[in-house]
Interface confidence: low
Amino acid sequence: QGKEVVLLDFAAAGGELGWLTHPYGKGWDLMQNIMNDMPIYMYSVCNVMSGDQDNWLRTNWVYRGEAERIFIELKFTVRDCNSFPGGASSCKETFNLYYAESDLDYGTNFQKRLFTKIDTIAPDEITVSSDFEARHVKLNVEERSVGPLTRKGFYLAFQDIGACVALLSVRVYYKKCPELLQGLAHFPETIAGSDAPSLATVAGTCVDHAVVPPGGEEPRMHCAVDGEWLVPIGQCLCQAGYEKVEDACQACSPGFFKFEASESPCLECPEHTLPSPEGATSCECEEGFFRAPQDPASMPCTRPPSAPHYLTAVGMGAKVELRWTPPQDSGGREDIVYSVTCEQCWPESGECGPCEASVRYSEPPHGLTRTSVTVSDLEPHMNYTFTVEARNGVSGLVTSRSFRTASVSINQTEPPKVRLEGRSTTSLSVSWSIPPPQQSRVWKYEVTYRKKGDSNSYNVRRTEGFSVTLDDLAPDTTYLVQVQALTQEGQGAGSKVHEFQTLSPEGSGN
């Protein structure tokens, strides 16, 4: 809202201003009346019955000061010419507003020629007879402006040309854009310019503990002719450690913090932080708690997790399935991952070493998010120790590790995978395979077979190769076949028992 600086206020002066009337003793007259139980003064003229009126009322000299454009607000009432006998043919319902600039007060020396007309003032509503009877005069309000003014002061003058007018209020003022706090920037009181299209650009200054955000525009406003601030550009934000309270930046209270210049308020120190002092930009972590570099300052401080809670290693031939449960203490974080490492030991020598290169994991063993993994291609008759470590975003900030280990001995080779390669009415050709790392430990393969349903007798064939043809079999008969590796240390795991059928004599031609 524009600030009005009043230079002249007739209504507020209580009849004390003593304006000049011309001609003297005729025309305009200072009168007193009552409105709303208050005595009011007014300059009135009502020479409506005789023509050729030229009655002037001139204000006292008004010092301009810093004003460039002045605004003139008039409150007046005009009587309806038709309320006079015969409609008063010479009666008018308007008057004229003039002004004159000067560097000195001419006193009672009144010269019409010095005055420049501002406008003809006409009422929006005229006061008719019935309004008078009801004690209700139609008050009109008109405003005009003049500028730019350049001299030390000025006069206003009112010319009556035969109206019945009462001038109740003459207020002359200029406008300033008031001192303003906006967007945490202070804009000084600024005199409104005199040219309507122009807008004066005014730079603002950030209030205490406020800053222009990085990459942001410096605060600026534009002061319009009517004293209104327009087109705000840029803004200030409360710096780190301070928050906006009304139009100021206030230090964060103890126990609160703000880590950057932003519009957000101070936040309470998160969990596992030490109480912050006033104006804190962050809250330090309690001993044993940490912040990862990417953690926001608003996040509680956290710690590394405890070890995986429960770890099992279940051997299945030359495979091990590792299963574990999450740590009982996550450290306050959700970014837990697991790493699995493997160590193998030779029972004979007791020698141990890493075995990452020789085993195969069901998924990459580092950065695991699931709580199980299968390790295969294990060598028989070897002791394996598996370590599962739990880590989170702050584990790298401490030297200690959180892990659990499980050991398993691989006593057998993996069961061979058996295939039927061919068959006849009296023979079955069978082949098998085992993982290459285990083949070196195999001495021979033992093939056991028997007729299905005959549990009293079975046949055994041994071979060093990976296939065998079983002869002298009965036609159209189902045989149960199992292959087992033999090592220096004993038997390996047997394969599944497979059912293979010899051909019937009718189909032997195939």
């Epitope: 009552i34 019955m49 009877e133 209700h136």
Partner: antibody, heavy 126, light 112 residues
């Protein structure tokens, strides 16, 4: 014929209430302001209250302010005076009078109270 | 005590001229407010006699006239007649009073 007729007067005890009415005829009631004026026995005229044509402006004499209420019903061409907390000094003949308010511009006739009713008597006594 | 001061009584013989004065102050008559005169015949309601200082409503004989000067006003009656015997009141407006309407104390005119 332009006429104002008051009614509602009577004997009332101190502290009591009365409502006076004034019926207007023969003119456009809604265009005129109205007054109540009273005259104590053997005394002069004393203005009591004023109401503008639209009821937007109301005035009271200091002696009755807060006790009396003036009102009007333009649709019924009627003026009223509600009198509460009556005192012995309120005993008087009460007149309603049609009114033209004084203008502050020269050349404009001010008609004063140009039509009066016949009056109604209010006696406040224990 | 009335704001406007009138003589309590005046008298005159039939055919004579009498005047009744009404004295105010700078907050009423002296402030430019109009003065009105009312006639109250015995046992009747007041009747407007002079309005706006010197104007006669229709029906009022021209034997009655009013004038105003400074802070005072006066009512003149010429060719006094027996039916003129009555109480006469002046009325104006006072900017210092609530409601502004003021009456004089009244003057009893006796026709001898």
């Amino acid at each position: 014929e332009v006429q104002l007729v008051e009614s509602g007067g009577g004997l009332v005890q101190p502290g009591g209430s009365l409502r006076l009415s004034c019926a207007a005829s023969g003119f456009t009631f809604s265009s005129y302001s109205m007054n109540w004026v009273r005259q104590a026995p053997g005394k002069g005229l004393e203005w009591v209250s004023y109401i503008s044509s639209s009821s937007s402006t109301i005035y009271y004499a200091d002696s009755v302010k807060g006790r009396f209420t003036i009102s009007r019903d333009n649709a019924k061409n009627s003026l009223y005076l509600q009198m509460n907390s009556l005192r012995a000094e309120d005993t008087a003949v009460y007149y309603c009078a049609r009114y033209r308010f004084p203008d502050f511009w020269s050349g404009y006739p001010n008609y004063g109270m140009d039509v009066w009713g016949q009056g109604t008597t209010v006696t406040v006594s224990s | 005590q009335s704001v406007l001061t009138q003589p309590p009584s005046v008298s005159g013989a039939p055919g004579q001229r009498v005047t009744i004065s009404c004295t105010g102050s700078s907050s009423n008559i002296g402030a430019g407010y109009d003065v009105h005169w009312y006639q109250q015949l015995p046992g009747t309601a007041p009747k407007l006699l002079i309005y706006g200082n010197s104007n006669r409503p229709s029906g009022v004989p021209d034997r009655f006239s009013g004038s105003k000067s400074g802070t005072s006003a006066s009512l003149a009656i010429t060719g006094l007649q027996a039916e003129d015997e009555a109480d006469y009141y002046c009325q104006s407006y006072d900017s210092s009073l609530s409601g502004h309407v003021v009456f004089g104390g009244g003057t009893k005119l006796t026709v001898l």
